[in-house]
């Protein structure tokens, strides 16, 4: 069977939503009412990888776009980017490791750890309107905890 993909939105633990900021960047900010329609809808694919009760490997694409969150080294630092792919070949069960995140849920907290760079997480800043990035610290100033709202296709 082909890879299963479900639509969802994410909010960080401060209730900031994720929106597009230019063609290849996401930012986090508080949205209300009609503005909630601006939030990015992800197509989350359940991909191949090491799995446990608390950890599920996923890829995060942007709904109806050939863009996926990926983790690469830039200037020797693990970096989050939006990468364009060939829609004829994606999503797939065996995604390249840079596209894979371990969705980890423990005690009402949801984290997305890079499979390529263990202990690096999708992160947001405390400040409003700042880019979503890959962070190497948990429990500090930056936010690594999210909630997820699945939405109908």
């Amino acid at each position: 069977a082909p890879v299963r993909s479900l639509n969802c939105t994410l909010r960080d633990s401060q209730q900031k939503s994720l929106v597009m900021s230019g063609p290849y960047e996401l930012k986090a900010l508080h949205l209300q009412g009609q503005d909630m329609e601006q939030q990015v809808v992800f197509s989350m694919s359940f991909v191949q990888g090491e799995e446990s009760n608390d950890k599920i490997p996923v890829a995060l694409g942007l709904k109806e776009k050939n863009l996926y969150l990926s983790c690469v080294l830039k200037d020797d630092k693990p970096t989050l980017q939006l990468e364009s792919v060939d829609p004829k070949n994606y999503p797939k069960k065996k995604m390249e490791k840079r596209f894979v995140f371990n969705k980890i849920e423990i005690n009402n907290k949801l984290e997305f750890e890079s499979a390529q760079f263990p202990n690096w997480y999708i992160s947001t800043s405390q400040a409003e309107n700042m880019p979503v990035f890959l962070g190497g610290t948990k429990g500090g100033q930056d936010i690594t905890d999210f909630t997820m709202q699945f939405v109908s296709s």
Epitope: A1, P2, R4, L6, N7, C8, F46, N53, D54, I56, E105, I106, N107, N108, K109, L110, F146, T147, M148, Q149, F150, V151, S152, S153
Partner: antibody
């Protein structure tokens, strides 16, 4: 023995609220995604709410979105469904079920609690 | 939403008969399909998941098959306790939806 027991159903007027509970036993509740599935009188089954094992993920179909809220208390092995702005068409038996989005199936069910919305 | 259509809506059969129920999806669901049994006045019970895998404790007379949009549920030798309504349910895309049910009676 693995068991789910629902409570909180009853008769309520349109526009009012009701809160259902589901108590679990016989398995480690905090490790399982949970759902509510309803069955209108003489009708089929409809999945109406989902919550992930830790509570960080939720899902509602369009028919109840914005009116129903699912939550859980893992320390008390209990699942909840807060139903607001109830409509006549919400009349159904409400089942608590183990499972949801990821595995896709519901492998343990409660006996159900009836909810009647009528003026 | 993907619609699930079961046929027949009801059927009668004798003890020992082979019984087949079909479920058709409005789009390809790639074997992401489950089957449930609901006996009168009781909660549903999972019988088959992933189109063909038997759930724990379910007798081997129950089986499932199919791919694409068309799926089949079979009872190889009908027993009196199999009197129930049977439902299919897909889990390919949200929302996951159930078929309308097939009511099985014994003649």
């Amino acid at each position: 023995e693995v068991q789910l027991v629902e409570s909180g159903g009853g008769v309520v007027q349109p526009g009012r609220s009701l809160r259902l509970s589901c108590s679990s036993s016989g398995f480690i509740f905090s490790r399982y995604d949970m759902s509510w599935v309803r069955q209108a009188p003489g009708k089929g089954l409809e999945w109406v709410a989902y919550i992930s094992h830790g509570g960080a993920g939720t899902y509602y179909p369009d028919s109840v979105k914005g009116r129903f809220t699912i939550s859980r208390d893992n320390s008390k092995n209990t699942l909840f469904l807060q139903m607001d702005s109830l409509r006549v068409e919400d009349t159904a038996v409400y089942y608590c079920a183990r499972g949801g989005v990821y595995k896709g199936y519901f492998d343990v069910w409660g006996q159900g609690t009836p909810v009647t919305v009528s003026s | 939403d993907i619609q699930m259509t079961q046929s027949p809506s009801s059927l009668s059969a004798s003890v020992g008969d082979r019984v087949t129920i079909t479920c058709r999806a409005s789009g390809n669901i790639y074997t992401y399909l489950n089957w449930y049994q609901q006996t009168p006045g009781k909660a549903p019970k999972l019988l088959i998941y992933n189109a063909k895998e038997l759930a724990e404790g379910v007798p081997s007379r129950f089986s499932g098959s199919g791919s694409g949009t068309d799926y089949t549920f079979t009872i190889s030798s009908l027993q009196p306790e199999d009197i129930a309504t049977y439902y299919c349910q897909h889990f390919w895309r949200l929302p996951y939806t159930f078929g309308q049910g097939t009511k099985l009676q014994i003649t």
